[in-house]
Interface confidence: low
């Protein structure tokens, strides 16, 4: 655990005065309809506020929208709608924000039937001013921006055209018919798929994997016989059709679509899929669906090529196709992940890794609970979380788990602990060291969020009744302060503060209601008077993460290197500040076998360090595919983990015999590519 | 309680190499960095350097770099220090202090300093032909 | 290297009067200082850290002042305990140096 401060609970001094001083009423001239929030840019606490209204007429439904903008973290609002001639907004495009903090916002509008074309407005000054602009095509998407370059602009059509602007949406051109589906690439790069004879849906498995690197002047076809494609890190997938029969395989690229190779991964039929959980620059976690319907597959995790696969995790839970996984990246502490195992009684337990799916093991019993009814033994047993999968059953579970790169080593989680999830009203769990140990946090389910990286942890009971009250922490929940923000108790809708959980504004979203209307209400609340003084230097401590053995050489060694980090005190109440930066020392760890995944043809006996080879391929020489040629392995069984730093120590080595023969199985190869120009 | 224990008094001659240890107990060893620091007879302390039991990374006043080599053993909680190629100069009494604040070497940024906590009882090396 | 020169080299004081002793850095050490007391054959002591924060079990009579450049380390009432050798220690940057003391004797 972290390093904690005595566990009695000390008040925050004056804290009713100071809050009731940086609390804000907003309350929305508005019926209630539904509302969207969005936060443009990083740091300019401008906030637009979209509201949406339908009154059901007898013919058809009548809309009506409203647009507001705050400039200061949600304190005060300003109707805007007249900046968009009053129009009525689609709320299923949402706003589309530019990347970074370029300003940009774009506003999909609700057009007659007869026109010619949809409506966009455009702002590229954090949406102070917009132009209104006709498209010459009507939208199926939302506007994509280019990572790159915030001024192109992507978007399909409802004909299935693919349109580009190189000028934020002033101009449009399209610049392929028979599109799928669409994604920018790195280097301003689309890929897109495309179909030949009827549908996308009914040419599926058919489809053209194209690329164009110069927005549409010249193409590349990079796949074949496509069902569809991916891209994660720096990889990417297609999933194409077998020749022989109905299955098909992943095959990867990493650079662009010029070569590819085949993943060694199952191959899956008709009802199965493919789904990349996470990616990153250095690898992939790839869950395999399982066939029939299972609800099941298996996770792989692959290595630093995306070409062979490591079996993480058995009988991991995806429902089906676009449904439910419990997948979860603890993004305050590397190498962490958590999922949920459908177990052979069709229980649901949730599993945790600290190795990037190296080893998968139970969540820790919180110290300070009971096993509950789930438990064969009252006495062992341990912390299941609640996720999508729970959220989708209507279990009463407001939110999934939180965490946050600079709130170094939370996690926030609804929880319960016994052998398995349970239906009953779960419990907040709170880790302090990235899901090593874990403690209860709050009693019941509520909605929670992290502020000022993690010097204040705010949460709302999560109730069918109005609201009032706010709960706030300024040691990572162990102690508690309730502060009632308003006489007038709310319907409460949610919780809202700026992403990068830097800030130290929160708003609490909700309604009024009376007898004959209800509107939208909002309460900021700025807690930067609860943390009077900037933090210095006295208020952190040093703290190495993935410890487990202070007395081991090796301790906190994971994926090749330990870090240490400079910690806030949970009893220091002080503010980290906008610009605080996570402050951490890496050290290189010795390499062990540990730091070695077993390559292709070799396995790892549960329990055991060593890759031993797959007995059915004892003897063989070991062909796979490579950039469209079979290739001649010659190896002792390892091949170092993605990302994994480690020097010295144990270093298998291998070599890899090149044949140059062709591969049969690789439909992707590059004598099958073939490029042409508009 | 918190302590440092040094290894007792040496007598070498000059061009020969001297190791002295330092056993912590009474706390979490690989917690806090150990600083090295020497007195001359009738002179000032001086920093050599300082170590991190967690890796056991290191870093070196450049006055003795090169001639100093600090290591740790974390199966013993102990610290050591040595100094080769010795002349007579470095006749003194050599400290091991624990410093809690030796991440400010690794993070210059650093605005505070906790100072060196808890000394050892010294080590007293003499160099004479 | 940061220089740290300390003032007067020696200080005699009565017993019950104040003492003051000053340390100058020869460059910004912000308040990453120490202060020591040092008695004949035995180890150094911390006194204060942080440029003025008392040390664990430190009499309350020991103050330390300053950042930045300029720091003071005051002995209110001087017991007779309190004749020592006394030094100043930055950790601004590396290599951390100590001034060259300041010896504290009975008038």
């Known amino acids: 655990s972290a390093p904690g401060e005595d566990e009695e609970c000390g008040r925050v001094r004056d804290f009713v005065a100071k809050l009731a001083n940086n609390t804000h009423q907003h309350v929305f001239d508005d019926l209630r309809g539904s509302v969207s929030l969005s936060w443009v840019g990083d740091s300019t606490g401008v906030i637009l506020v979209l509201t949406t209204f339908h009154v059901p007429l007898v013919i058809m439904t009548f809309g009506q929208s409203k647009l507001y903008r705050s400039e200061d973290y949600g304190k005060n609002f300003k109707d805007i709608t007249d900046l968009i001639n009053n129009t009525f907004i689609r709320t299923e495009f949402g706003m589309a924000i530019g990347p970074e903090n370029s300003g940009k916002v774009v506003l999909t509008a609700e057009v007659s039937g007869g026109s010619r074309g949809g409506r966009i407005f455009r702002s590229s000054d954090f949406a102070k001013n917009f132009v209104q602009t006709d498209l010459p095509f009507h939208p199926l998407t939302q506007m994509m921006y280019s990572p790159q370059n915030s001024d192109y602009l992507l978007a399909l059509s409802t004909e299935n055209g693919l349109w580009v602007s190189k000028n934020f949406g002033g101009k449009w051109e399209e610049i392929h018919k028979a599109v799928c589906l669409a994604k920018w690439g790195s280097d301003n790069t689309i890929f897109f798929t495309t179909y030949a004879n009827g549908s996308c849906k009914a040419d599926l498995g058919a489809l053209e994997l194209w690329r164009t690197s110069d927005l549409g002047k010249s193409f590349k076809t990079i796949g074949v016989k496509i069902y569809s494609f991916g891209l994660g890190g720096r990889f990417l997938f297609a999933s194409v059709m077998a020749d022989k029969d109905t299955t098909r395989r992943i095959h990867v690229s990493t650079d662009q679509g010029d070569t590819w190779s085949m993943a060694q991964l199952p191959s899956v039929g008709q009802e199965q899929f493919y789904s990349i959980l996470a990616a990153n620059d250095d690898m992939v976690f790839m869950h395999v669906d399982e066939p029939g319907d299972t609800g099941f597959g298996t996770i792989f995790t692959s290595d630093d090529r995306g070409i062979v696969y490591s079996k993480s995790l058995d009988r991991h839970l995806y429902t089906t196709t676009g449904g439910e996984t419990d997948f979860t990246n603890v993004t305050s502490l590397r190498g962490v992940y958590i999922t949920s195992v459908l177990s052979e009684d069709n229980s649901i337990q949730t599993m945790i890794t600290f190795d990037q799916g190296g080893r998968w093991t139970h969540l820790r019993k919180p110290e300070n609970s009971e096993c509950d009814a789930t438990a064969k033994n009252k006495n062992e047993c341990s912390l299941h979380i609640h996720a999508s999968y729970s959220i989708s059953q209507k279990l009463n579970v407001p939110m999934a788990p939180l965490s946050e790169p600079n709130a170094v080593g939370i996690v926030i989680a609804h929880g319960s602990v016994g052998d398995a999830i349970s239906v009953m009203v779960p419990d907040v769990y709170i880790s302090d060291d990235g899901g090593y140990s874990w403690t209860k946090m709050l009693e019941g389910p509520h909605y929670y969020t992290i502020l000022d990286s993690g010097g204040i942890i705010v949460a709302i009971e999560h109730s069918s009744r109005p609201i009032n009250v706010i709960k706030f922490s300024t040691d990572e929940g162990q102690c508690w302060q309730t502060y009632t923000f308003t006489r007038d108790p709310i319907y409460f809708t949610g919780l809202a503060s700026e992403p990068g959980a830097r800030s130290m504004n929160i708003s609490i979203w909700g309604f009024t209601e009376s007898f004959l209307t209800s509107q939208w209400v909002s309460y900021t609340i700025d807690f930067k008077d609860i943390l009077e003084r900037n933090c210095e230097e006295k208020d952190y401590t040093i703290w190495l993460a993935h410890s487990t053995d202070p007395e081991d050489y090796e301790d906190g060694c994971i994926l090749g290197y330990k870090e240490q980090f400079l910690r806030l005190r949970k009893s220091s109440v002080c503010q980290n500040g906008r610009d605080y930066v996570v402050t951490k020392q890496p050290s290189i760890c010795l390499c062990s076998l540990e730091d070695f995944l077993c390559d292709f043809g070799y396995y790892r006996p549960e329990n055991d360090s060593k890759c031993v080879e797959q007995p059915e391929l004892k003897g063989h020489d070991l062909e796979f595919c490579l950039y469209g040629r079979e290739e001649h392995l010659t190896t002792n069984g390892y091949r170092k983990i993605p990302g994994d730093k480690c020097q010295g120590g144990v270093n298998p080595v291998r070599e890899v015999k090149d044949l140059k023969k062709k591969c049969t199985s690789n439909f992707l190869s590059p004598e099958k590519q073939n490029s042409k120009s508009n | 309680q918190v302590q440092l224990v040094q290894s007792g008094a040496e007598v070498k001659k000059p061009g020969a190499s001297v190791k002295v240890s330092c056993k912590a107990s009474?706390?979490?060893?690989?917690?806090?960095?150990m600083s090295w620091v020497r007195q001359a007879p009738g002179q000032g302390l001086e920093w050599m350097g300082i170590i991190n039991p967690i890796g056991g990374s290191t870093s070196y006043a450049q006055k003795f770099q090169g001639r100093v080599t600090m290591t740790r053993d974390t199966s013993t909680s102990t610290v050591y220090m040595e100094l080769s190629s010795l002349r007579s100069e470095d006749t003194a009494v050599y400290y091991c202090?624990?410093?809690?604040?030796?991440?400010?070497?690794?993070?210059?940024?650093?605005?505070?300093?906790?100072?060196?906590?808890?000394w050892g009882q010294g080590t007293t090396v003499t160099v004479s032909s | 290297e940061i220089v740290m020169t300390q003032s007067p080299a020696t200080l005699s004081v009565s017993p019950g009067e104040r003492a003051t002793l000053s340390c100058r850095a020869s460059?910004?050490?912000?308040?990453?200082l120490a202060w020591y007391q040092q008695k004949p054959g035995q180890a150094p002591r911390l006194l204060i850290y942080?440029?003025?924060t008392r040390a664990t079990g430190i009499p309350a009579r020991f103050s330390g002042s300053g950042s930045g450049t300029e720091f003071t380390l005051t002995i209110s009432s001087l017991q007779s305990e309190d004749f020592a050798v006394y030094y100043c220690?930055?950790?601004?940057?590396?290599?951390?140096?100590f001034g060259g003391g300041t010896k504290v004797e009975i008038k």
């Open positions: 009474g706390y979490t060893f690989t917690k806090y960095y």
């Open positions: 202090a624990r410093d809690p604040s030796g991440i400010a070497l690794a993070f210059p940024a650093s605005r505070y300093y906790y100072g060196m906590d808890v």
């Open positions: 220690q930055q950790a601004r940057l590396g290599p951390w140096t």
């Open positions: 942080g440029a003025s």
């Open positions: 460059q910004s050490v912000s308040s990453n």
